[in-house]
Amino acid sequence: SGTTNTVAAYNLTWKSTNFKTILEWEPKPVNQVYTVQISTKSGDWKSKCFYTTDTECDLTDEIVKDVKQTYLARVFSYPAGNVESTGSAGEPLYENSPEFTPYLETNLGQPTIQSFEQVGTKVNVTVEDERTLVRRNNTFLSLRDVFGKDLIYTLYYWKSSSSGKKTAKTNTNEFLIDVDKGENYCFSVQAVIPSRTVNRKSTDSPVECMGQEKGEFREI
């Protein structure tokens, strides 16, 4: 039961990439507004996005306090212009979100190849260590800081002149691979969290090829 002409939110969905986390829901409001609350399983409810006509709420600031906690959110519906009004049960209409554990569920953003350097028949490929909004001691942590060895990168590489790919893995942000002398290679990387059962992989990085801006060639 709820206030006349007020409908409960539905399709509450977490959208999260590299811990940037937004709760989305439906419907677009008609003569109503929403307020979101978020809590850990054992914590108190905290209100966010007060009396908004949006159908999304950025909850990043809350979840980055402890990305390994499990969070629950709820969306309250109020009549526009009468937000003190409550349902017949004495409280506004609301709907709960699914539970969300950022560390296990945030999507891995598309990685970027920062640089590559050839020294003779070896190439060192470095993946950019993207900054997240997770903080420790007032500094923003990188993806590697947060996930540690739980995060691995897969490198795909191939000769510019052929389509046959090879692959290598690292649990740092650097690869050292063997290449044929005098050949140009192209590279792409993918982030993976092996311990997960879903959302394990990122999309592939943009392809970077030798003989273009990013790299450096040194004949030793």
Epitope: A168, K169, N171, R196, T197, V198, R200, K201, D204
Partner: antibody, heavy 117, light 107 residues
């Protein structure tokens, strides 16, 4: 529970092709690569290649020179391996396996391919 | 390509014995190594991943050690069901090569 179920054994003539299927269930198919490994009679394990169902990327053992072609059908969570220009030395048991990045944790039961004139 | 040299090729032992198998990589693979058991007519079964980690449901008598190029696999007290062939595999770079296998037989 997690299962990889492979198609039945095949007997083929030299020069022919064969397609082996591997139907996955019990997990999110696109989250894990599917590896293919073969074992010739009385011999060890030989890695053939893998396919990433998430992005379609295939990696092959380049020493096998185009022997295998790997594909997936995401709608049925099925991986396929086609072997072409079969020769007697391709007689083997072919396994598919789920890759957890650090190892192969679940394996199909194996498909015996016999090449004989 | 990375070569994996496994030794010994075969090994005779008795129930209760401690046995060790080694695997040598031709170049450094950090800890990107797995160990498998295979019984005749069956599929391989994962025992150890990331060189030292026991796979789910695998008895604690199995263990792995090593990093870089030198790895070993130990069964602390052989049980009757452990007589099988064991393989190492590097999962560092393609092609993801296997060792030649070690056949563990009853003495």
């Amino acid at each position: 529970q997690i299962q990889l179920v492979q198609s039945g054994g095949e007997v083929k003539k030299p020069g022919a092709s064969v397609r082996v299927s591997c139907k996955a269930s019990g997990y999110s198919f696109t989250d894990y690569n599917v590896y293919w490994v073969r074992q010739s009679p009385g011999k060890g394990l030989e890695w053939i290649g893998y396919i990433d169902p998430y992005n379609g990327i295939t990696i092959y053992d380049q020493n096998l020179k185009g022997k295998a072609t790997l594909t997936v059908d995401k709608s049925t969570s099925t991986a396929y391996m086609e072997l072409s220009s079969l020769r007697s030395e391709d007689t083997a048991v072919y396994f598919c396996a789920r890759d957890v990045t650090t190892a192969l944790d679940f394996w199909g039961q194996g498909t015996t391919v016999t090449v004989s004139s | 390509d990375i070569q994996m040299t496994q030794s010994p090729a075969s090994l005779s032992a008795s129930v209760g014995d401690r046995v060790t198998i080694t695997c040598l990589a031709s170049q450094t693979i950090d800890t990107w190594l797995a160990w498998y058991l295979q019984k005749p007519g069956k599929s391989p079964q994962l025992l150890i991943y990331a060189a030292t980690n026991l796979a789910d449901g695998v008895p604690s008598r199995f263990s792995g050690s090593g990093s870089g190029t030198d790895f070993s696999f130990t069964i602390s007290s052989l049980q009757p069901e452990d007589f099988a062939t064991y393989y190492c595999q590097q999962v560092y770079s393609s092609p993801f090569t296997f060792g030649q296998g070690t056949k563990l037989e009853i003495k």
